[in-house]
């Protein structure tokens, strides 16, 4: 059993069919000694006496808020959660696998620069009695400050028969700089608690490698003069790294139909223009990707053909 | 347009072009020691993360862009600040501080020279022959020091006369690779900016 | 599976026209991008030009401009490339070859030996 | 138009062993360079796309790499059906132009 913060503790159990579970001996803060009773959540059923009261914990039905009492007074809670080991492995019921870029992936994490700051994303189909708590640091053995806001839901959509709900969270690191070179990862814990579940995860990443810049910005088109060919440029967007000449970008430029199945024109081009054939119900697109690190492509910025 | 128009300097643009080179030969070698390594802890998640120049080079903080100068988090190990003399840089445009970042880069390549040869005369030893340092990657380190031009002491090529770990010798040289790609990918943005100034 | 066949092989004399034809099959013959490339005895090839089955876009290269016409027909899913004032250096293979994507070639057809002799 | 030379225009090489062929472009293309490979009496077929991308049904021995102006097609260890010519082609503007090949011959 450990504390996860004040009055809130966690239970860690090996879950198997008749498994003997924890002992549990909780202590009632106060100054009192004698006629101190003990009930469950809010039942008025008294499970104990005295300043301890020791439990055996194997399932749900025995965590919860246990409270100590006096004349009718409460005196102090403490809330027990389960932390379920099944087979050696934590579960993992709360958050639901993105399974990208690979399997077992509950958190996403991107960076539009090299700030030091970046974002975190989860998935889960429950909607009520769910709390997050998130904290982060550069490296685990000496960490180094990385301060994250509060977990907020963030989008909501429909699966199929389920509701699916996206909860995200911005973290800055506490003193970044954008050239340096990271030799020690960014650790992301989360802390999620649905009911009396407790579970916890983890991603373990590099700045450099969760890049993700925004579109390219102010697409424009010249159509040149007896040709089917358009000139098409665009800016840095504004959130991207500065000086450009030192955090540079590459680009790819597409020009498609409606239909991915389409035929396309497609360039590749460290500069920030480019010459393509447009098509008729066509759209420009142009998307950005670090020039010498190549992490992920930005979205796609367009502009009808037209 | 965002990035700066600047006709490249013909003294600066062999080493962009070189430096270009030694970024796609270093990636090319970790891509290719990542497949053949493939049992091996070789991937970024997979190996402790350690820079052979740490406190010997600052490479980094000595071509810092003066955009970021101002940052202090950039700042903390600076003893002078900004990114020369090198035959890559006109004689015109040459500052202390960018020999000193041209100058720094040059140690790195040559530390990484040393350790790479050393590694590749024991990979040549390994009966299962498995892996080798790409000839082309070498070559491109040779290429780009020569175009830096800066003479210093010759750093003797370790030899060792215990037997070697193969085991080890080759999780070092995804440790080293994928240390060097960093760097290689910092001395890219470096000549990209040293060229667009 | 996308396949090009090409007319047969054609022999003409210099100042001449030669048509070849292209015709595609297994697949929306308006889906792809249709060009035509040439290579001469023991050379390297040589791009001639783009064709839009889709709407009759076209695009040469700047060598073969004014003496190149592509056209297509799409009721039979056939492309054609007429060269006019053939002469004797226009000797080669000329191929149609196609792809979704305008600028480079995925399916090739056989190609159709062009000899211009007098 | 934009010039693309390869290098060497032939090239010996022992089956089971590497060959490393080069393609140079005049100007910057970024990564757009194609690899085709043609047999005698055949017509061209694409191996490698936007100078690394591989084509499905195409060996794994054939690899592509590059960006700028200078680009790799690496077989990896030659088999007896790979002895060809070997064309790159840029798409970075119009007109599209070939390197003039490299012949890979039996050593």
């Known amino acids: 059993i450990w504390e996860l913060k004040k009055d809130v503790y966690v239970v860690e159990l090996d879950w198997y069919p008749d498994a003997p579970g924890e002992m549990v001996v909780l202590t009632c803060d106060t100054p009192e000694e004698d006629g101190i009773t003990w009930t469950l959540d809010q039942s008025s059923e008294v499970l104990g006496s005295g300043k301890t009261l020791t439990i055996q914990v194997k399932e749900f039905g025995d965590a919860g808020q246990y409270t100590c009492h006096k004349g009718g007074e409460v005196l102090s809670h403490s809330l027990l959660l389960l932390h379920k080991k099944e087979d050696g492995i934590w579960s993992t019921d709360i958050l639901k696998d993105q399974k990208e870029p690979k399997n077992k992936t509950f958190l996403r994490c991107e960076a539009k620069n090299y700030s030091g700051r970046f974002t975190c994303w989860w998935l889960t189909t429950i909607s009520t009695d769910l709390t997050f708590s998130v904290k982060s640091s550069r490296g685990s053995s000496d960490p180094q400050g990385v301060t994250c806001g509060a977990a907020t839901l963030s989008a909501e959509r429909v699966r199929g028969d389920n509701k699916e709900y996206e909860y995200s969270v911005e973290c800055q690191e506490d003193s970044a700089c954008p050239a340096a070179e990271e030799s020690l990862p960014i650790e992301v814990m989360v802390d999620a608690v649905h009911k009396l579940k407790y579970e916890n995860y983890t991603s373990s990443f590099f700045i450099r490698d969760i890049i993700k810049p925004d579109p390219p910005k102010n697409l424009q088109l010249k159509p040149l003069k007896n040709s089917r060919q358009v000139e098409v440029s665009w800016e840095y967007p504004d959130t991207w790294s500065t000086p450009h000449s030192y955090f540079s970008l590459t680009f790819c430029v597409q020009v498609q139909g409606k239909s991915k199945r389409e035929k396309k024109d497609r360039v590749f081009t460290d500069k920030t223009s480019a010459t393509v054939i447009c098509r008729k119900n066509a759209s420009i697109s142009v998307r950005a990707q670090d020039r010498y690190y190549s992490s992920s492509w930005s979205e796609w910025a367009s502009v009808p053909c037209s | 347009r965002n990035l700066p128009v600047a006709t490249p300097d013909p003294g600066m643009f062999p080493c962009l072009h070189h430096s270009q080179n030694l970024l796609r030969a270093v990636s090319n070698m970790l891509q290719k020691a990542r497949q053949t390594l493939e049992f091996y802890p070789c991937t970024s998640e997979e190996i402790d993360h350690e820079d052979i120049t740490k406190d010997k080079t600052s490479t980094v903080e000595a071509c810092l862009p003066l955009e970021l100068t101002k940052n202090e988090s950039c700042l903390n190990s600076r003893e002078t600040s900004f990114i020369t003399n090198g035959s890559c840089l006109a004689s015109r445009k040459t500052s202390f501080m960018m020999a000193l970042c041209l100058s720094s880069i040059y140690e790195d390549l040559k530390m990484y020279q040393v350790e790479f040869k050393t590694m590749n005369a024991k990979l040549l030893m390994d009966p299962k022959r498995q892996i080798f340092l790409d000839q082309n990657m070498l070559a491109v380190i040779d290429e780009l020091m020569q175009a830096l031009n800066f003479n210093s002491e010759t750093v003797p090529q370790k030899s060792s006369l215990e037997e070697p770990d193969f085991y080890k010798t080759k999780i070092k040289l995804c440790i080293l690779l994928h240390a060097f790609r960093i760097r290689a990918v910092t001395i890219d943005r470096v000549m990209s900016y040293l060229n667009a100034s | 599976q996308v396949q090009l066949v090409q007319s047969g092989a054609e022999v003409k004399k210099p100042g001449a026209s030669v048509k070849v034809s292209c015709k595609a099959s297994g697949y929306t013959f308006t889906d792809y991008y249709l060009h035509w490339v040439r290579q001469a005895p023991g050379q390297g090839l040589e791009w001639m030009g783009w064709?839009?089955?889709?709407?009759?876009?076209?695009e040469h290269a700047p060598k073969f401009q004014g003496r190149v016409t592509m056209t297509t027909d799409t009721s039979t899913s056939t492309a054609y490339m007429e060269l006019r004032s053939l002469r004797s250096d226009d000797t080669a293979v000329y191929y149609c070859?196609?792809?979704?994507?305008?600028?480079?070639?995925?399916?090739w057809g056989q190609g159709t030996m062009v000899t211009v002799s007098s | 138009e934009i010039v693309m030379t390869q290098s060497p225009a032939t090239l010996s090489v022992s089956p089971g062993e590497r060959a490393t062929l080069s393609c140079r472009a005049s100007q910057s293309i970024s990564i757009n360079l194609h690899w085709y490979q043609q047999k005698p009496g055949q017509a061209p077929r694409l191996l490698i796309y936007?100078?690394?991308q591989s084509i499905s049904g195409i060996p794994a021995r054939f690899s592509g790499s590059g960006s700028g102006t200078e680009f790799t097609l690496t077989i990896s260890s030659l088999q007896s059906e790979d002895f060809a010519v070997y064309y790159c082609?840029?798409?970075?503007?119009?007109?599209?132009?070939f390197g003039g090949g490299t012949k890979v011959e039996i050593k």
């Open positions: 936007f100078a690394s």
């Open positions: 064709i839009d089955p889709e709407n009759g876009d076209t």
């Open positions: 082609q840029q798409s970075n503007s119009f007109p599209l132009t």
């Open positions: 070859a196609a792809n979704k994507e305008l600028r480079y070639f995925d399916v």
